[in-house]
């Protein structure tokens, strides 16, 4: 009978046992265990009937299709085997083990005792069949093994071979190289590889095989296992293997597919191209006169670009456009892009206007083109080129016009300062009262009127200004200071205040220039109480035209002794101390108590010491500061009272032959005007020069040596 | 025509504020000063202080300068005078003056506990 | 703070005869810059704002009759009423405004 057992181990023993076996009995067990396994037997015990080729009593160990061994006996001789120590091993999860006794026993047997079980089978150790075995790394565990694969390969679908994801390889590059996976080592085995060149429309791909070539084939069919495929629209180049690389392949496409399939099995190193754009070409390019074309190549292709430049002075002209470059393409049907431009001269064409200056041209027919040269200058004798610039400026290469120092930035024209069209008087004896000013004399000269419209009725007064530039009047604090009913010190707004220059008659006006103020600023300083910093300026709406009536007067250096004592100033004004004259009568009146026509004295300036004793004799609160100075005479006299409030006090610079503002009529008295021993006061304008040119917004260095030359 | 128009009679305790209004008409409201003076029943007059609309700027009398406040809403031509902590004595009649020429007619004001 | 003295307290005046009136200031109201005296003269009539009537001590201000006539300078000045009329009646103040402005304090005027 036979008895099936599934167990992973388990005892087999003789019938009876440990008793003797009966005779004439044939019993079979059917081991069974699970895939993965295989099944050990050992005997612990084994006495059966000895008989030549174990002819009468035996055990017999098999698998479905393999006697394995046959026991009996009692010990092993030539013609009979007893199992002993040995154990049997099963090939696979199966075996059968049949015991048979004959029918007569000469003696009695104790029959056989005998244990089996189920062992791992380590397939990893064991699978010699290529076919079966794992592609890269065979993990083993009990009852089965899996495979796995290196870094950038995939386990295929059959659980064994190792492929690659390689069928999404795009190449848009004009040149390129392709390989099979792993190149040179031995490509993976059932895969499907998929390389894809785009190159743009008008390109055509040529493809040439490198190095080694070794796809697995067959000698008989042509490639079956492993290949290479080129399509090339509908057409199929291929399929290619074995050794031997295709000839270079011109493709007459700018679109290629490769198709490379491996199958599971095999070891070759596979293959490498290098693939290049052919492209059309385009006719050989002359360059333009005065010009050049990079790169200068013997054959231009498809998509090769050219750079159309011009020698220095020239600009490259293109459809009435002119540009420092030009580029053209070389297109896919072999023409190009673009006629090569021509080069022209550089024009820098008319140059900018310089206010207040002039332009001549230095090369003939006024040319503007490359090298040629213009020359500013100011219009003298009322302004003057700034640093002593030269004024030379050559058309560059880069169409503008260029001063070695300036660069492209024109020269500036600077008022002249401190120079009138009429010769001033240098030694007029003292005038009681003041004289007629010629027109031109003090061209520096501003009527300054203010009309506070805040209050009502509207509040007026002038004063007098000195003129500094096309654009600054310099006057004293107090004549734009706000007359608030505190003692805050507040300008006046700037819509409230009208500048007159050029004037000479007060009742005509007509040759006057009039501007309103931008900005009026006040030294921040300002004492309302002592006058101390009496300084001020006023921005004009626009730049006042120069001329022979209107100029400018120089400010002093900077030094805070001031003018000399002794020294002799001009004080010009319109004499203008009646206080019932409104500021009406004073701009459209002929009225007598004032002087219709400009007036000046010449005073001396006082020791320090000895206008500091004179107003401290005095009864009441004076203070003359180190920022003022004094002017006049001891025995008194008119004159010292003729400047209008903010007028310049000028001296003659002998070292610049130039008139300098060094003061401002600021205060004087309170005895009457012109009394014995009142000096007039007035602002030190050499301790102020700094904030001057700050206001203004020039560095000092800029203008000084207008009075210093 | 040119005028100034104030807002009407006030009775305030003692402690409390007091906001006079003054609508100008007929001139550039913005352009001109607009000045605060009282006048207490059967005295004189006393300046307060006085505004420039258009910028703002502000001048006190010293008396007042810790308890008057004026302020201008351009939008309105409107002066404003806000008096505070208030006491008998500030009992009077307070007029708008546009910079010295054009007088409100006044707002009475009674500071009574 | 300049103090502003007016005199007299009140004054009787006959209809058509001169009324005169003084104003004494504690410093004087002459600005050197604009050249002009800040002394204004306001007339108030019984229960009505003041009226301008004289600004920068002698301007008579547009409307005022011309029997207003204002003089003086530095620090002493006078409102004159040349012919005094019934309308007249009415309590004259001066008013410094050189610096932050103070008022005198008044002169009524009346009829004999």
């Known amino acids: 009978h036979t008895v099936e057992l599934n167990n992973m181990f388990g005892q087999i023993q003789s019938p009876g046992y440990p008793d003797s076996y009966p005779s004439d009995s044939e019993v079979t067990w059917n081991i069974t265990v699970p895939d993965g396994f295989r099944i050990k037997l050992y005997f612990m015990h084994f006495n059966l009937e000895s008989s030549y080729l174990c002819e009468y009593d035996y055990v017999k160990v098999e698998t479905e299709d393999q006697v394995l061994a046959t026991f009996c006996g009692r010990e092993t001789t030539d013609t009979e085997q007893t199992p002993g120590q040995e154990v049997v091993l099963s090939p696979g999860s199966f075996m059968s083990i049949t015991f048979r006794s004959d029918f007569s026993n000469e003696e009695r047997f104790t029959g056989f005792d005998a244990h089996y079980m189920a062992v791992d089978v380590d397939e990893c150790k064991e699978r010699e069949d290529e076919e079966l075995s794992c592609d890269h790394y065979c993990h083993n565990y009990i009852g089965g093994y899996y495979c796995s694969c290196r870094f950038g390969y995939i386990l295929h679908t059959d659980n064994r071979t190792c492929r690659v994801e390689c069928s999404d390889n795009l190449f848009t590059q004009r040149t390129g190289v392709i390989t099979s996976p792993d190149f040179p080592n031995p490509y993976p085995k059932s895969s499907e590889c998929l390389y894809t060149i785009e190159l743009e429309e008008g390109f055509m791909v040529n493809l040439q095989f490198e190095d080694i070539f070794d796809i697995e084939d067959h000698p008989e069919v042509p490639c079956p296992y492993d290949y290479i495929k080129i399509k090339v629209g509908p057409k199929v180049l291929g399929p290619f293997c074995g050794e031997k690389a295709p000839e270079p392949i011109s493709t007459q496409s700018h679109s290629v597919l490769i198709l490379f399939h491996s199958d599971n099995s095999g070891e070759n190193r596979g293959w490498r191209l290098s693939y290049r754009a052919a492209g059309n070409e385009c006719p050989e390019l002359q360059p333009p006169v005065h010009g050049k074309i990079e790169p200068s190549q013997a054959k231009y292709f498809f998509k090769d670009q050219v750079l159309v430049s011009c020698d220095t002075g020239y600009k490259v002209l293109k459809d009435n456009v002119e540009m420092d470059t030009f580029q053209i393409e070389c297109l896919k049907d072999g023409t190009w892009s673009n006629k090569i431009p021509t080069c022209k001269i550089v024009d820098c064409r008319a140059p900018g206007e310089l206010e207040h200056g002039l332009i001549t041209f230095s090369t003939r027919n006024n040319l503007t083109t490359y090298k040629s040269e213009i020359k500013y200058s100011c219009q003298e004798p009322y302004y003057k080129m700034l640093n002593n610039n030269t004024g030379i400026y050559t058309c560059s290469a880069q169409g503008v016009w260029m001063n070695k120092v300036l660069g492209r930035s024109l020269p500036t024209c600077l008022p002249e300062c401190g120079q009138p069209s009429r010769s001033l008087p240098s030694l007029v004896k003292r005038i009681i009262g003041g004289r007629n000013a010629e027109p031109g004399l003090f061209p520096w000269q501003a009527l300054i009127v203010v009309e506070d419209t805040s209050r009502v009725p509207n509040d007026k007064w002038f004063g007098s200004g000195a003129l500094l530039s096309a654009s600054w009047i310099l006057t004293a604090a107090h004549v734009l200071r706000s007359q608030r009913r505190d003692t805050t010190v507040i300008p006046v707004s700037k819509e409230h205040v009208t500048v007159y220059l050029g004037l000479h008659d007060v009742r005509d006006k007509s040759g006057a220039v009039n501007s309103s103020a931008a900005r009026v600023v006040l030294h921040p300083d300002f004492n309302i109480q002592n006058y101390n910093h009496d300084i001020a300026l006023v921005q004009l709406q626009e730049p006042v035209p120069l001329g022979p009536h209107v100029m400018p007067v120089c400010l002093p250096r900077l030094e805070p002794e001031g003018p000399a004592p002794h020294m002799l100033g001009l004080v010009a004004g319109w004499g203008i101390s009646n206080p019932n004259v409104t500021v009406d009568e004073i701009i459209s009146s002929g009225t007598r108590t004032l002087s219709d026509v400009l007036q000046y004295v010449k005073l001396p300036v006082v020791p320090h010491a000895e206008c500091k004793t004179s107003y401290e004799s005095r009864s009441g609160n004076y203070s003359v500061t180190e920022n003022m100075f004094c002017a006049g005479y001891y025995e008194g006299g008119k004159d010292t009272c003729l400047g209008d409030s903010g007028g310049a006090f000028v001296i003659f610079d002998d070292l610049s032959q130039r008139w300098v503002v060094q003061g401002l009529v600021s205060w004087g008295g309170p005895e009457e005007c012109g009394s014995k021993q009142v000096y007039g006061v007035y602002t030190k304008v050499s301790n102020y020069v700094d904030w001057v040119w700050e206001q203004m917004g020039l560095p000092q260095s800029v203008v000084e040596p207008q009075v210093e030359r | 025509q040119v005028q100034l128009v104030q807002s009407g009679a006030e009775v305030k305790k003692p402690g409390a504020s007091v906001k006079v209004s003054c609508k100008a008409s007929g001139y550039t409201f913005t352009g001109k000063w607009i000045e605060w003076v009282r006048q207490a029943p059967g005295q004189g007059l006393e300046w307060i202080g006085e505004i420039l609309p258009g910028s703002g700027s502000t001048d006190y009398n010293e008396r007042f300068k810790d308890r008057a406040t004026f302020t201008a809403d351009t939008s309105t031509s409107t002066a404003y005078m806000e008096l505070s902590s208030l006491r008998s004595e500030d009992t009077a009649v307070y007029y708008c003056?546009?910079?010295?020429?054009?007088w409100g007619q006044g707002t009475l004001v009674t500071v009574s506990s | 703070d300049i103090v502003m003295t007016q005199s007299p307290d009140s004054l009787a005046v006959s209809l058509g005869e001169r009324a005169t009136i003084n104003c004494k200031s504690s410093?004087?109201?002459?600005?050197?810059?604009?050249?002009?005296?800040?002394l204004a003269w306001y007339q108030q009539k019984p229960g009505q704002s003041p009226k301008l009537l004289i600004y920068?001590?002698?301007t008579r201000e547009s409307g005022v009759p011309d029997r207003f006539s204002g003089s003086g300078s530095g620090t002493d000045f006078t409102l004159t009423i040349s012919s005094l009329q019934a309308e007249d009646v009415a309590v004259y103040y001066c008013k410094q405004s050189y610096t932050l402005p103070t008022f005198g304090g008044g002169t009524k005027v009346e009829i004999k």
């Open positions: 410093q004087s109201l002459l600005n050197s810059v604009t050249r002009k005296t800040y």
């Open positions: 920068w001590a002698s």
């Open positions: 003056v546009r910079s010295e020429d054009l």
